[in-house]
C-alpha cells in the first residue's frame, strides 16, 4: 500500500531513509538536458523474496539532443563523491550495517540523474530527520516519521525535531545535547 502523502516537512531539516521497504518506487528522473531512454522503465521498484531484496529495472538517461545513444549506467567517481551521504544518527548507522529483511538499500546513482530523488513510499516506511548545516536541534525528540495505516487511510507520524539558527543554547548546567553530524544531507529526499 503506497503512502498517500509526502513525509512531513521540518523547517531547516532534511530527511533520509536508511533502507526502503519492498514496494517502494523510485522515479527515473534525469537532469536538465537529458531524458530517460525510450525503452527504459519510468521507475525502479524494490522487490524481493524472503531472503533477498533488490531494485528491479535500471534507470538510464540519455542526452536529449543525442539519438540512439545510451549513456553508461556506472557513475563517474566525481558523481559518486557528490552523492555520498553522511550518517544521520546512531540508530541509522546501526541499521546501515545490517541488511534489513524485506528492504532495499539506497540505489547507486546513475549517470546524469536528477539532483533530487522522488520516492513513492509504502506503509511501514521510516524516514529520519536531521537539521541542515548551519542549524542545530533546539529539541530532538523522536526525529523520525513512520507511514502508518489508520482507519483505512495512510498518515505519517509527526517527527518531534525543532531546528533553529539561533545561537546561545541555554542548557542545563553540565548537560550537553548529543550533536548531529555537522554536515546536513547533500539533498533532501522527496516523495510524491
Amino acid at each position: 500500500e503506497l503512502c498517500d502523502d509526502d513525509p512531513p516537512k521540518i523547517t531547516h531539516a532534511t530527511f533520509k531513509a536508511v533502507a526502503y521497504k519492498e514496494g517502494t518506487m523510485l522515479n527515473c528522473e534525469c537532469k536538465r538536458g537529458f531524458r530517460r531512454i525510450k525503452s527504459g522503465s519510468p521507475y525502479m521498484l524494490c522487490t524481493g523474496n524472503s531472503s533477498h531484496s533488490s531494485w528491479d529495472n535500471q534507470c538510464q538517461c540519455t542526452s536529449s539532443a543525442a539519438r540512439n545513444t545510451t549513456k553508461q549506467v556506472t557513475p563517474q567517481p566525481e558523481e559518486q563523491k557528490e552523492r555520498k551521504t553522511t550518517e544521520m544518527q546512531s540508530q541509522m548507522q546501526l541499521a546501515d550495517q545490517v541488511s534489513l529483511p524485506g528492504h532495499c538499500r539506497e540505489p547507486p546513482p546513475w549517470e546524469n540523474e536528477a539532483t533530487e530523488r522522488i520516492y513513492h513510499f509504502v506503509v511501514g516506511q521510516t524516514v529520519y530527520y536531521q537539521c541542515v548545516q548551519g542549524y542545530r536541534a533546539l529539541h530532538r525528540g523522536p526525529a523520525e516519521s513512520v507511514c502508518k495505516m489508520t482507519h483505512g487511510k495512510t498518515r505519517w507520524t509527526q517527527p518531534q525535531l525543532i531546528c533553529t539558527g539561533e545561537t546561545e543554547p541555554s542548557q542545563f548546567p553540565g548537560e550537553e545535547e548529543p550533536q548531529a553530524s555537522p554536515d546536513g544531507l547533500p539533498e533532501s529526499e522527496t516523495s510524491r
Epitope: G141, Q158, L161, I162, S170, Q171, F172, E175, E177
Partner: antibody
C-alpha cells in the same frame, strides 16, 4: 492517556513575579518540546516561547525576551513559566501545549494582575 | 515575523451548512500550518496539522487544504457542537504566530 495539568489561578500585584507549572503525564515527557501560549480576556492566542524538555534550551518571542523564563524539571515531568515585572496587560489565561503541532494543551492557568 | 490573517472574523451558519474559513500567511510557509477549535472557557483543540492532516479523533467532516500562503479549513456539514472560535497558526519558524480567530455561531 496524555495529560497536561497546570497549576491553579493566581492574583498578583503589578511589579510582582509569577511562576506557573505544567505537569505532563501519559507519554515520554522529554520526547516533546513544550510551548507556552497566553490569551488575554476576549482576545486571541499569543505565543510566548518554546523549551526543549530534553536539553532545557529555549526560544522566546521577542516581546517576552528578558521577562519570561521557561524551565523544565525532567525528574517530575514538569515545565515552568516564570514572568517577572508583571503589569495589568499580563492578565490572561496561560496555556502550555505539547510538541511541534501543539497536539495537547493544558487546561490553562488564569492570571490576574491588579493593584 | 510572519503575520497570519483569518477571514471572516465571525460567521453564522445553520446545521448542515458547508462552512469555509480561510487563513493567509504574510510569506510562504509551505504546509507548516495548524487549525485549532476553541470553545468558551476551554483550551484550544488541535483539528488539523501540516495544513491537511486530520488530528486523531477529529470527525471527518473537518478538512484542511492549501499550501504556501493560502489555507482553508472546511466543515462539510456543520453540526451543533461545531460552534466556537477557530484559529490558524504556523510553525514554519519561531516566533510561531496565530491568526486573530474566526468566531463561528450556529444559527
Amino acid at each position: 492517556q496524555v495529560q497536561l495539568v497546570q497549576s491553579g489561578a493566581e492574583v498578583k500585584k503589578p511589579g510582582a513575579s509569577l511562576k506557573i507549572s505544567c505537569k505532563g503525564s501519559g507519554y515520554t515527557f522529554t520526547d516533546y518540546a513544550m510551548h507556552w501560549v497566553r490569551q488575554a480576556p476576549g482576545q486571541g492566542l499569543e505565543w510566548i516561547g518554546v523549551i526543549s524538555t530534553y536539553s532545557g534550551d529555549a526560544i522566546y518571542a521577542q516581546k517576552f525576551q528578558g521577562r519570561a523564563t521557561m524551565t523544565v524539571d525532567k525528574s517530575t515531568s514538569t515545565a515552568y513559566l516564570e514572568l517577572s515585572s508583571l503589569r495589568s496587560e499580563d492578565t490572561a489565561v496561560y496555556y502550555c501545549a505539547r510538541g511541534v503541532t501543539f497536539d495537547y494543551w493544558g487546561q490553562g492557568t488564569t492570571v490576574t494582575v491588579s493593584s | 515575523d510572519i503575520q497570519m490573517t483569518q477571514s471572516p472574523s465571525s460567521l453564522s451558519a445553520s446545521v448542515g451548512d458547508r462552512v469555509t474559513i480561510t487563513c493567509r500567511a504574510s510569506q510562504d510557509i509551505s504546509n507548516y500550518l495548524e487549525w485549532y477549535q476553541q470553545k468558551p472557557g476551554k483550551a484550544p483543540k488541535l483539528l488539523v496539522y501540516n495544513a491537511k492532516t486530520l488530528a486523531e479523533g477529529v470527525p471527518s467532516r473537518f478538512s484542511g487544504s492549501g499550501s504556501g500562503t493560502d489555507f482553508t479549513l472546511t466543515i462539510s456539514s456543520l453540526q451543533p457542537e461545531d460552534f466556537g472560535t477557530y484559529y490558524c497558526q504556523h510553525h514554519y519558524d519561531t516566533p510561531y504566530t496565530f491568526g486573530q480567530g474566526t468566531k463561528l455561531e450556529i444559527k
